[in-house]
């Protein structure tokens, strides 16, 4: 089996985590995709998911999490806006393939959110002053309760992020985007031990 690794991201309160999950294969384009948190010793908890079938370029918002699936480029964009210290924890993207287990990504995100230089949003000189407005036309999708027992791992302490109720609009200042990419292994390639060099030797773009 392929070892799941973690990458650590340190952000300040009020900033934005912007993740690209690279699912690559066309057969996954319309599949429902989810963003999960893995709490210490527990099963992964789905915080947000796309619709089923997943719609192209159609934002789905659950609280401060926005998912957007770009079928034509094989990318799921996950944004967690206005980060709070309580959002610290271990996260992953998965693709639902019922009745099979979800397809997991290689790298999980160990997110650490710390207090900013001051309690006032926008006071950080190093941050941009963009205001993100999430349009109220975004959709909240119903997520399956199904999680894979294989994904239970030891997560960092303080993995207590909960998702607030959906907001119709989010104004966000003090934004720093962290762009990263992740890889999926296709089930067939695993079976045939044909894991691509791209997947084995991928590079991360921050």
């Amino acid at each position: 089996a392929t070892k799941l690794t973690e990458e650590k991201y340190e952000l300040k309160e009020g900033q934005t985590l912007d993740v690209k999950c690279d699912y690559t294969l066309e057969k996954f384009a319309s599949s429902q995709k989810a963003w999960q948190i893995i709490r210490d010793g527990e099963m992964p908890k789905t915080l947000a998911c796309t619709e089923r079938p997943s719609k192209n370029s159609h934002p789905v918002q659950v609280g401060r999490i926005i998912l957007e699936d770009y079928h034509d480029h094989g990318l799921l964009r996950v944004r967690m806006v206005n980060l709070q210290v309580e959002d610290s924890g271990l996260y992953q993207c998965v693709i639902y393939q019922p009745p099979k287990e979800p397809h997991m990504l290689f790298d999980r995100i160990a997110l650490v959110v710390t207090k900013g230089f001051s309690g006032t949003p926008g006071s950080n000189e190093n941050s941009t002053q963009n205001v993100y407005k999430i349009p109220p036309t975004t959709t909240k999708a119903l997520c399956p309760l199904y999680t894979s027992p294989r994904t239970v791992t030891q997560a960092p302490p303080k993995s207590t992020a909960d998702v607030s109720t959906p907001d119709s609009e989010i104004n966000l200042t003090n934004v720093t985007d962290i762009i990263r990419e992740q890889k999926l292994i296709s089930e067939e390639d695993l079976e045939q031990k044909l894991i691509s060099e791209e997947d084995l030797h991928h590079h991360h773009h921050h």
Partner: antibody, heavy 121, light 111 residues
């Protein structure tokens, strides 16, 4: 090991037709889009077109220079991609390569050795 | 269509010296800061070989003297220390939108 083997090339008169085949092995053929790329002698590479997978309804895309004359198809049960070339012109003379990408809009990691198509009277 | 223009058309560099090839796109080949621009090497009588994918990622098995950089419309392939076996034609290619396109190629020779 991934292998792509082209066949079907040869000499054909202008206005004629030819069908190229690309036999694939070493990977799950149905999972990936397949492309054709050509190269005239001493010239650069030209992307001819691609065919996507069943989950994308086998959608096809072509370069403007071949649109309406060339047709790409695939038979997943035979692990084979095809390039049907009609109304051939002398400028279609080239080595034709079959390539496999690494996924949606990803790079061409695997290439066949190519098959030569000569259009001449 | 996105036009890729490589420069120079040909290049002669001494063994052990740095070789730089540029590729300019007529419009951005990025989606979310994710550049769908790749580099290939082709030697006479052989099919092209992938060197760099998505602007800066080294393909497995390719010597680390090869590197790629750039985003948006401007990209560079660099060979840090030219070796005799690097003599070839180099192509950039974009897959951000259909139709996919290649640059016209840059011929690299030993000075």
């Amino acid at each position: 090991e991934v292998q792509l083997v082209e066949s079907g090339g040869g000499l054909v008169q202008p206005g004629g037709s030819l069908k190229l085949s690309c036999a694939a092995s070493g990977f799950t053929f149905s999972t990936y889009a397949m492309h054709w790329v050509r190269q005239a002698s001493g010239k650069g590479l030209e992307w001819v077109g691609r065919i996507r997978t069943k989950s994308s309804n086998y959608a096809t895309y072509y370069a403007a220079s071949v649109k309406g004359r060339f047709t790409i198809s695939r038979d997943d049960s035979k692990n084979t991609a095809y390039l049907q070339m009609n109304s051939l012109k002398t400028e279609d003379t080239a080595v034709y390569y079959c390539t496999r990408d690494m996924g949606i809009r990803r790079q061409f990691a695997y290439w066949g050795q190519g098959t030569l198509v000569t259009v001449s009277s | 269509d996105i036009v890729l223009t490589q420069s120079p058309d040909s290049l002669a560099v001494s063994l052990g010296e740095r070789a730089t090839i540029n590729c300019r796109a007529s419009e951005s080949v990025d989606t979310f800061d994710y550049s769908f621009l790749h580099w290939y090497q082709q030697k006479p009588g052989q099919p092209p070989k992938l060197l760099i994918y998505r602007a800066s990622n080294l393909e497995s098995g390719v010597p680390d003297r090869f590197s790629g950089s750039g985003s948006g419309t401007d990209f560079t392939l660099t060979i840090s220390s030219l070796q005799a076996e690097d003599v070839a034609v180099y192509y950039c290619q974009q897959s951000n939108e259909d139709p996919y396109t290649f640059g016209q190629g840059t011929k690299l020779e030993i000075k």
